[in-house]
């Protein structure tokens, strides 16, 4: 594939990555699918600086990120190591709460209104952020 050197239309460049911010909500899996079809992924937060950048753009709105524990341990969608990486959970989170009455626990992470993270039911229709890295090889040509 060709190397991506600038961000797509309607995406925001920051620190050699491109970000796209939704204006409506989808379930985590639909948001994940949307980003992957854009040759991107749900945002992976690797630093306090990136956290503040994303937080500034999303405002005080629940927003999905690319972090989940649907298969057991917490995992970032791009393979970034969770255990050694940046974290910004709210106090007492993640708690895998079962008391919501929707079945199961809470397996998907989102930014809360103050930017800190919470785990929630993956079916909830929250906004989402896609991220793709500049200078990486694009998996697909832009037009077919």
């Amino acid at each position: 594939g060709s190397e991506r050197t600038c961000c797509p239309v309607n995406w925001v460049e920051h620190e050699r990555s491109c970000y796209w911010f939704s204006r409506s909500g989808k379930a985590w899996a639909d948001a994940d699918n949307y980003c992957r079809l854009e040759d991107a992924h749900l945002v992976v937060v690797t630093s306090w600086e990136e956290q503040k950048f994303v937080q500034h753009h999303i405002g005080p709105v629940n927003t999905w990120m690319g972090l989940h524990d649907q298969n057991g341990p917490w995992k970032w969608v791009d393979g970034t190591d969770y255990e050694t990486g940046f974290k910004n959970w709210r106090p007492e989170q993640p708690d895998d709460w079962y008391g919501h009455g929707l079945g199961g626990g809470e397996d998907c992470a989102h930014f809360t209104d103050d930017g800190r993270w919470n785990d929630d039911v993956c079916q909830r229709p929250y906004r989402w952020v896609c991220e793709t890295e500049l200078d990486k090889a694009s998996q697909e040509p832009p037009l077919l």
Epitope: P8, Y34, E38, L144
Partner: antibody, heavy 113, light 107 residues
Framework: QVQLVESGGGLVKPGGSLRLSCAAS????????MNWIRQAPGKGLEWVSY????????YYADSVKGRFTISRDNAKNSLYLQMNSLRAEDTAVYYC??????WGQGTLVTVSS | DIQMTQSPSSLSASVGDRVTITCRAS??????LGWYQQKPGKAPKRLIY???SLQSGVPSRFSGSGSGTEFTLTVSSLQPEDFATYFC?????????FGPGTKVDIK
């Protein structure tokens, strides 16, 4: 509530052209990739084309490549399919779909001499 | 292209029956699979997404399972309004492809 309404179908002769439209409402159109999907009479479903939310990434099924053109106008919450060089085998009900979540009721395209 | 096969192609069942429909992908598709219900002259309706997540507003008698290449839709107790055609859709890569459908009618 979410609504997708297709229009523009009808009877056309082989080699002719049609332009299908899909009017979207009840959701944030610019946050959704869109698809055209068709179903020939008595047959299964066939994906036809995809366009991403900003209109810059497009894919087509091999069966329509070079003949059909997908486009969208986010300001008008509308999706289009320009169909040229139509063939009898293009006869089908054409559905628009937002992501793979919401579908319209479809519009019938009949290609016959 | 990823081929989707679906079985059975049709089945006859009674109200209250447990019904299971299977889709198989010719190669791994993660969990990028949806199940849809279609009634004559109507728009398809998504029942299940991401292989096992229930679409909002869909009755809990519908469930999905599977990952990779084999997927199942189960209706735990068939209701009169469930007689319809069901199909799967993979959307992991282009071209998106559908299963040929399963028609569920009254025994």
């Amino acid at each position: 509530q979410v609504q997708l309404v297709e229009s523009g179908g009808g009877l056309v002769k082989p080699g002719g052209s049609l332009r299908l439209s899909c009017a979207a409402s009840g959701f944030t159109f610019s946050d959704y990739y869109m698809n055209w999907i068709r179903q020939a009479p008595g047959k299964g479903l066939e994906w036809v084309s995809y366009i991403n939310s900003n209109g810059f990434t497009i894919y087509y099924a091999d069966s329509v490549k070079g003949r059909f053109t997908i486009s969208r106008d986010n300001a008008k919450n509308s999706l289009y399919l320009q169909m040229n060089s139509l063939r009898a085998e293009d006869t089908a009900v054409y559905y628009c779909a937002a992501d793979t979540i919401y579908w319209g009721q479809g519009t019938l395209v009949t290609v016959s001499s | 292209d990823i081929q989707m096969t679906q079985s059975p192609s049709s089945l006859s069942a009674s109200v209250g029956d447990r019904v299971t429909i299977t889709c198989r992908a010719s190669q791994g598709i993660r969990n990028d699979l949806g199940w849809y219900q279609q009634k004559p002259g109507k728009a398809p309706k998504r029942l299940i997404y991401a292989a096992s997540s229930l679409q909002s507003g869909v009755p809990s008698r519908f469930s999905g399972s599977g990952s990779g290449t084999e997927f199942t839709l189960t209706v735990s107790s068939l209701q009169p309004e469930d007689f319809a055609t069901y199909f799967c859709l993979q959307h992991t890569s282009f071209p998106f492809t559908f299963g040929p459908g399963t028609k569920v009618d009254i025994k």
